[in-house]
């Protein structure tokens, strides 16, 4: 997260980290006791999922292995359209004050809405500095018309843009798949942006979760 600050303790109990061994790979969100939602470009063969602590490496955190993941069938490695994936935990997460399910959206939030993006990704770019504590930054949803002025035909209609004019505030590497939460509901998953991260007036691009609630529910039901 660029130009952010540590999240208020316990304010993001649905936030998870997907680890490869002990190394941060991506962010994600807990949908229920068995399922994590993340970005399709975060696909690996096996995951270790960190839940229940804002601090990576915290021994009090839950660590659960996951071996099954289901990319959206329409994901494209060229255009990154439909950049979302469900990861099935090998054992159930224990819900607590620090481990809660995210609220999936019942509607798409409009441009101008203030949202929070969070993650353990690098806080500097191109030099990398990985924090141990979960970082947050507030950004505003940007209309597709305004975002298309920047990204032209790279922008697909299930992509959501967010940023702050003339500001560096943005996600970065390691934040992929993590949540963009607006008014208490999950509206986006970190998908992509320009490099180095945090270039003013280059919005972050997110998978627009409100367009995929049916696929999320159907996929969890299908692979119970």
């Amino acid at each position: 997260i660029i130009d952010g600050a540590p999240c208020a303790r316990g304010s993001h109990p649905w936030q998870v980290a997907l680890l490869s061994g002990n190394q941060l790979h991506c962010g994600g969100v807990l949908v229920n006791e068995r399922w994590v939602l993340t970005a399709a470009h975060c696909k690996m063969n096996e995951y270790t999922v960190h839940l229940g602590s804002d601090t990576l490496g915290d021994r009090r955190a839950q660590r659960i292995k996951a071996s099954k993941s289901f990319r959206h069938p329409g994901y494209s490695t060229q255009t990154h359209v439909n950049d979302l994936m469900l990861v099935k935990l090998n054992s159930q997460a224990r819900l607590s004050s620090m481990v809660k399910k995210v609220r999936l959206p019942s509607r798409c939030e409009p441009p101008g809405t203030t949202c929070t993006v969070s993650g353990w990704g690098t806080t500097t770019s191109p030099d990398v500095t990985f924090p141990s504590d979960l970082m947050c930054v507030d950004v505003k949803l940007i209309s597709p018309q305004d975002c298309t002025k920047v990204y032209k035909d790279l922008l697909e209609n299930s992509m959501l843009c967010a940023g702050i004019p003339d500001s560096k505030k943005n996600a970065c590497n390691g934040d992929s798949g993590g949540p963009l939460v607006c008014r208490g509901t999950l509206q986006g998953l970190v998908s992509w942006g320009t490099f180095p991260c945090g270039q003013p007036n280059d919005p972050g691009v997110y998978t627009q979760v409100c367009k995929f609630t049916k696929w999320i529910n159907d996929t969890m039901k299908k692979h119970r």
Epitope: H41, T77, Q78, D83, D153, V190, W192, F195, V205
Partner: antibody, heavy 127, light 108 residues
Framework: QLQLQESGPGLVKPSETLSLTCTVS??????????WVWIRQPPGKGLEWIGS???????YYNPSLKSRVTISVDTSKNQFSLKLSSVTAADTAVYYC???????????????????WGQGTTVTVSS | DIQMTQSPSSLSASVGDRVTITCRAS??????LNWYQQKPGKAPKLLIY???SLQSGVPSRFSGSGSGTDFTLTISSLQPEDFATYYC??????????FGGGTKVEIK
């Protein structure tokens, strides 16, 4: 300003292993979110990608060379290296090291352009 | 593997001419296409990345366009220092990263 410099023997015998090193100055190889790349150019021919390594040590190889190639990083010396085994005359080329600049973060981080190059070193395979 | 086909393989032009080089990918590569200039005995130099973005320090007479499978490098007014070989390069999600065969721009 980042600079790259290739070094290694200019002559290698057939069936032996070619070993080259690229020394990076003006930036730390282990803390920069870039790819570190090896490319070669046979005499009078075009460019061929050999492989790449990122700051975390993940490697990516050209499938046509994969069985013979190893790329590694020595962070203490700020270097990355290339080993190409069982060489033949067809491996005679100018070998370049380069920095791969990602075209974005997240899903666009896997794509890159080589924005800084070494000057190249000529390797001849001959007995 | 994705094949990159450049045309023409060589061309002769005069100072001040507008020069266009094309690069075609065997399948869609979105905008993940970069252009390089190489002079004899020198390393390649990045000119254009992401199909149309001008690399810092490169003169504005160079421009790139295209998306999907067809891409173009244009030199609006050829200068003496532009006589060189030009390569396109696609940056893939899966290896290998591949280059076009090159276009040699010579003095007419």
């Amino acid at each position: 300003q980042l600079q790259l410099q290739e070094s290694g023997p200019g002559l290698v015998k057939p069936s032996e292993t070619l070993s080259l090193t690229c020394t990076v100055s003006g930036g730390s190889i282990s803390s920069l979110d870039y790819y570190w790349v090896w490319i070669r150019q046979p005499p009078g021919k075009g460019l061929e990608w050999i492989g790449s390594i990122d700051y975390s040590g993940d490697t990516y190889y050209n499938p046509s060379l994969k069985s013979r190639v190893t790329i590694s990083v020595d962070t203490s010396k700020n270097q990355f290296s290339l080993k190409l085994s069982s060489v033949t005359a067809a491996d005679t080329a100018v070998y370049y090291c380069a920095r791969g600049r990602p075209l974005g973060y997240g899903a666009r981080h896997y794509y890159y352009a080589m924005d800084v190059w070494g000057q190249g070193t000529t390797v001849t395979v001959s007995s | 593997d994705i094949q990159m086909t450049q045309s023409p393989s060589s061309l002769s032009a005069s100072v001040g001419d507008r020069v266009t080089i094309t690069c075609r990918a065997s399948q869609s590569i979105s905008s993940y296409l970069n252009w390089y200039q190489q002079k004899p005995g020198k390393a390649p130099k990045l000119l254009i990345y992401s199909a149309s973005s001008l690399q810092s320090g490169v003169p504005s007479r160079f421009s790139g366009s295209g998306s999907g499978t067809d891409f173009t490098l244009t030199i609006s007014s050829l200068q003496p220092e532009d006589f060189a070989t030009y390569y396109c390069q696609q940056s893939p999600y899966f290896p290998p990263l591949t280059f076009g065969g090159g276009t040699k721009v010579e003095i007419k």
